[in-house]
Amino acid sequence: ELCDDDPPEIPHATFKAMAYKEGTMLNCECKRGFRRIKSGSLYMLCTGNSSHSSWDNQCQCTSSATRNTTKQVTPQPEEQKERKTTEMQSPMQPVDQASLPGHCREPPPWENEATERIYHFVVGQMVYYQCVQGYRALHRGPAESVCKMTHGKTRWTQPQLICTGEMETSQFPGEEKPQASPEGRPESETSC
């Protein structure tokens, strides 16, 4: 079941999933000057069964000939400054990611892909937060958020993370301390 909204925004932080639950959509977005091909998929889908999952559909971008002539669409300043969602950085692949049943790995990039990946997560998905460069993490608890179903509605738990403006970066779980790898957590505590 799809989560109704996006994971919470934390000032000066981005989030990332280490693996994607079956049913997750990744929108086929293209960088400026390119657009999804007319016969191309709207999104990729993490699909499969408990033993093997993979991304269905392929995203394809083509050079954009026709642009809007109206200039009403202008990026918001805060969106130009700082991306809140999953960025296309060099994706870290924890070694145990593939062994998670019912999950997909981070899909490989496609040609002329947009810089930001737009996911539609499903109930039970966990995402992990890190402070953007130039900010340091103050943890009051886990820097993660889980999409849960309560009373027929979906909601994301609030990550216990504050990013302060000090020149030091915090890492996603598993990037620095392998013993703290989140994938060891039982799935039951995130599923509804």
């Epitope: 959509m25 400026r32 998929s41 026709t66 539609h120």
Partner: antibody, heavy 114, light 107 residues
């Protein structure tokens, strides 16, 4: 909570134009395509086109090229559709949709009558 | 354009029944199909995406299946609140198209 709030019903004269709005809330407006759908009794649902507010891109159903113009204003998180040279065939309910068709506005009823 | 055909315009059912609404595409769409429910005077409500995945809050008596050109929405243990019109849609290629709809009525 995701919401798409559409503007109210319109009664318009043949040959004129109408511009309706769709205000999005509860998600990042610039991340997702906004689609527009026409519904007429006996004609089912027809996809008019869509707009990506973050990328300034539009796609149109050939049938509605020249009839519909899609625009968006990211500051107010509002998408607009203008219909021109209206005829009785344009009398319908128009829906906007967001987040890959997961959410639909309540619809705007357009009645073209002299 | 890819034409979606819902051959049955009307279907009669009773509370507790199991009913299957079918949708046939004129061209292969993979699993890029959605199902919507529309009640009189209301907007369509998204039920299923990617042929078989339920949206949140959709009761599990609604199941979608199929791929390629043939798709089915099955409602098991029909409830009175399920009486509505059901539309399929393909979003595999532009222009996106909808089926003509199937109205579920009480016997």
């Amino acid at each position: 909570q995701v919401q798409l709030q559409q503007s109210g019903a319109e009664l318009v004269r043949p040959g004129t134009s109408v511009k309706m709005s769709c205000k999005a809330a509860g998600y990042t407006f610039t991340n997702y395509w906004i689609g527009w759908i026409k519904q007429r009794p006996g004609h089912g649902l027809e996809w008019i086109g869509d707009i990506h507010p973050g990328g300034d891109y539009t796609n149109y159903n050939e049938k509605f090229k020249g009839k519909a113009t899609l625009t968006a204003d990211t500051f107010s998180s509002t998408a607009y559709m203008q219909l021109s040279s209206l005829t009785s065939e344009d009398s319908a309910i128009y829906y906007c949709t967001g987040r890959n068709f997961a959410y639909w506005g309540q619809g705007t009823l357009v009645t073209v009558s002299s | 354009d890819n034409v979606l055909t819902q051959s049955q315009k009307f279907m009669s059912t009773s509370v507790g029944d199991r009913v299957s609404v079918t949708c046939k595409a004129s061209q292969n769409v993979g699993t890029n199909v959605a199902w919507y429910q529309q009640k009189p005077g209301q907007s369509p409500k998204a039920l299923i995406y990617s042929a078989s995945y339920r949206y949140s809050g959709v009761p599990d008596r609604f199941t979608g299946s199929g791929s390629g050109t043939d798709f089915t929405l099955t409602i098991s243990n029909v409830q009175s609140e399920d009486l509505a019109e059901y539309f399929c849609q393909q979003y595999n290629s532009y222009p996106y198209t909808f089926g003509g709809g199937t109205k579920l009525e009480m016997k």
